[in-house]
């Protein structure tokens, strides 16, 4: 008789990434009988919630329920009804909410409370909404990419299952860039982590990892831009800001009140003799780069070496996966290829920033102007952060891999977060068992 396939015995999990600029919902799926195996969980859906990040709802919390509806309904459709009640839902909020909490714990708590009540209305197993720490964000991003790259698997393979695999068990470092913060996480080579706040110890699949991580709040690409504008407007002679980080011919009016609406610009705050100013782009990469470098305080370091702002950073070690906005921005600029050297990236950024705004708008007609206008700044910022902030060099640049997805799953903290909360990464190596017989009869 012919073997007949049984109904697949699978499980699902949902994680919402409540970032500073938007919220994304991820649905993960895995075979129920292989929960402790490495690399079995994969992403089946990503749903981007329409609208801003949840921190922007602070004065209109009653709108949060409607905001989340479309993506939660999408999850209802994707996950079989029979699985709804046992599908865990987690929401993690990142730097946008960390910034709101700096202003008021109550305000952040009120937003999360409404989020929790909204998510509890769905038939899933809601497990809570919380603001994750920058350390967690870095750690879970590192776990995600190494899990997907098969770095935790003890089985050596003669073939490569993923494009970045160097076929050894050396873990990749993780570089994550968001709108409000950026994280750097890696295993240093035999280096003492001099600052306890930056040290993590993991035991995963029977192996110990001593991991360095730091999250730079206010150094995500959006908050870095606000910082730069607040810094530069201090020395402007009038309400015109000639800005090298925007294309020649670009013009935009900024409200001073919006500029100072974030804790990230407090250090540059001053009384200005105008309520608004106009950005006028001049499109000069080198000047833009110089302006960005002024955001990094490299004059003070209480350790053997630092990134910037007095934060310890060990010598860089091994390969790095750069994801989230590192990837999105470089992908737009067509600079993600492994073959593009750092010098070539810099050259291309010089040319891109110098292109007139009208020309750029024509070349990228399908892209929203708000986003399109900021790629010169964002690309320059990424180079500045990686080279001067984290001390990558022209030589070590080739160890940075700009990654969007690995094996169909987005690189980011959400998968690592779910793996941890569902106890799917064992401390010890599971005993190897014969191939499961349960799939076919």
């Amino acid at each position: 008789t012919q073997n007949k396939a049984l109904p697949e015995n699978v499980k699902y999990g949902i994680v919402l990434d409540a970032g500073s600029s938007h919220t994304s919902l991820y649905i993960y799926k895995w075979p129920a009988e292989k929960e402790n195996d490495t690399g079995v969980v994969h992403q089946v859906e990503e749903c981007r919630v329409k609208g801003p990040g949840i921190s922007k709802f602070v004065q209109k919390v009653n709108e949060i329920g409607i905001y989340l509806t479309d993506c939660m309904e999408r999850a209802r459709e994707v996950i079989p009804r029979s699985q709804h009640q046992e599908t865990p839902v987690y929401l993690g909020a990142t730097a946008g909410m960390r910034l709101l909490r700096m202003e008021s714990e109550e305000l952040a708590d009120r937003v999360l409370d409404v989020v929790e009540r909204s998510l509890s209305n769905y038939p899933f197993d809601f497990q809570g909404a919380r603001i994750i720490t920058g350390q967690e964000e870095g750690a879970y991003g590192w776990i995600t990419i190494n899990y997907l790259l098969g770095k935790f698997s003890q089985k050596t393979r003669w073939f490569s299952i993923v494009p970045y695999e160097t076929n050894n068990q050396e873990t990749f470092g993780a570089l994550d860039l968001g709108g409000a913060s950026t994280q750097v996480t890696f295993v240093p080579q035999n280096q003492t982590i001099e600052s306890p706040d930056n040290a993590l110890q993991f035991r995963l699949y029977g192996k110990d990892y001593n991991v360095y991580t730091h999250s730079f709040l206010c150094y995500g690409k959006d908050q870095a831009l606000w910082q730069k504008l607040a810094k530069d407007i201090q020395v402007a002679s009038n309400e015109i800001l000639r800005d090298p980080c925007f294309h020649p011919g670009y013009k935009k009016v900024v409200n001073v009140s919006d500029l100072y609406k974030t804790p990230c610009t407090k250090r540059f705050e001053m009384t200005l003799p105008f309520q608004q100013f106009e950005i006028q782009g001049i499109g000069n990469y080198q000047q833009c780069h110089q302006s960005i470098l002024e955001l990094f305080n490299t004059s003070y370091c209480p350790y053997s070496q630092c990134a910037f702002n007095g934060i310890f950073l060990p010598p860089l070690q091994g390969d790095f996966g750069a994801f989230s906005a590192f990837y999105f921005v470089m992908k737009f600029l067509n600079l993600t290829s492994e073959k593009v050297s750092q010098e070539k990236v810099t050259e291309m950024m010089k040319k891109f920033c110098a292109q007139p705004w009208e020309e750029i708008k024509t070349s990228y007609a399908g892209v929203k102007e708000k986003y399109l206008s900021e790629y010169c700044f964002s690309g320059t910022y990424i180079l500045s952060l990686l080279l001067q902030g984290y001390h990558f060099t022209a030589d070590s640049w080739e160890h940075i891999h700009f990654i969007g997805k690995i094996q169909g799953s987005d690189a980011g903290w959400t998968l690592g977060y779910m793996l941890n909360l569902t106890n799917m990464i064992p401390a010890e190596q599971p005993l190897s068992t014969p191939l499961s017989h349960s799939t076919y009869v």
């Epitope: 602070v58 700096m102 008021s104 714990e105 109550e106 305000l107 009120r110 009140s257 610009t265 407090k266």
Partner: antibody
Amino acid sequence: EVQLVESGGGLVQPGRSLKLSCLASGFTFNNYGMNWIRQAPGKGLEWVASFSSSSTYISYADTVKGRFTISRENAKNTLYLQMTSLRSEDTALYYCVRHGRYGGYGGFYFDYWGQGVMVTVSS
Amino acid sequence: DTVLTQSPALAVSPGERVSISCRASEGVKSYMHWYQQKPGQQPKLLIYKASNLASGVPARFSGSGSGTDFTLTIDPVEADDTATYFCQQSWNDPTFGAGTKLELK
């Protein structure tokens, strides 16, 4: 030492306007949310308006919404309350008050209060 | 608005323990705070977030509760504690209780 000094009070006719000021010293002004709270003679405390440390959250009591405007000038360490269309029930001692902090996070409780400035609305 | 209900007055003897209650019309988590106001003076923060003692406040003062029911306890009461005590919630836009007047026998 934290000090909050209110000014600008006085006697005003119903329907008229008045602007209160509060000069802060002894702390980094732009790191704290600020508020106006009032107390009618012989009565309890009534929160009037809040302005968070950045301008993320500006909020008013329903009794003053649309008539009063809270603002701050961080470089001058000064908080303001612009009051328009004043009514007799706005008669009160107006306190300038600082938000507290829960460790590194802002809090909507009130840890330092000025001496208060009297506003009397009467014809 | 979240309404806070306090008993209007209490009279105790010095050296005794007194508890002043505050009930919220809806849950306010632990976002309840307590103030002392003496005649002719501005209010003074005593307790924040239900149970945390404010800087410079004697350890005779303590706070407890969460959700809707909160208590300010003074043990032992001293003559200088004659004042009106207000509770305030910050889970929603701030509201105060009407105050409890503490008098010493």
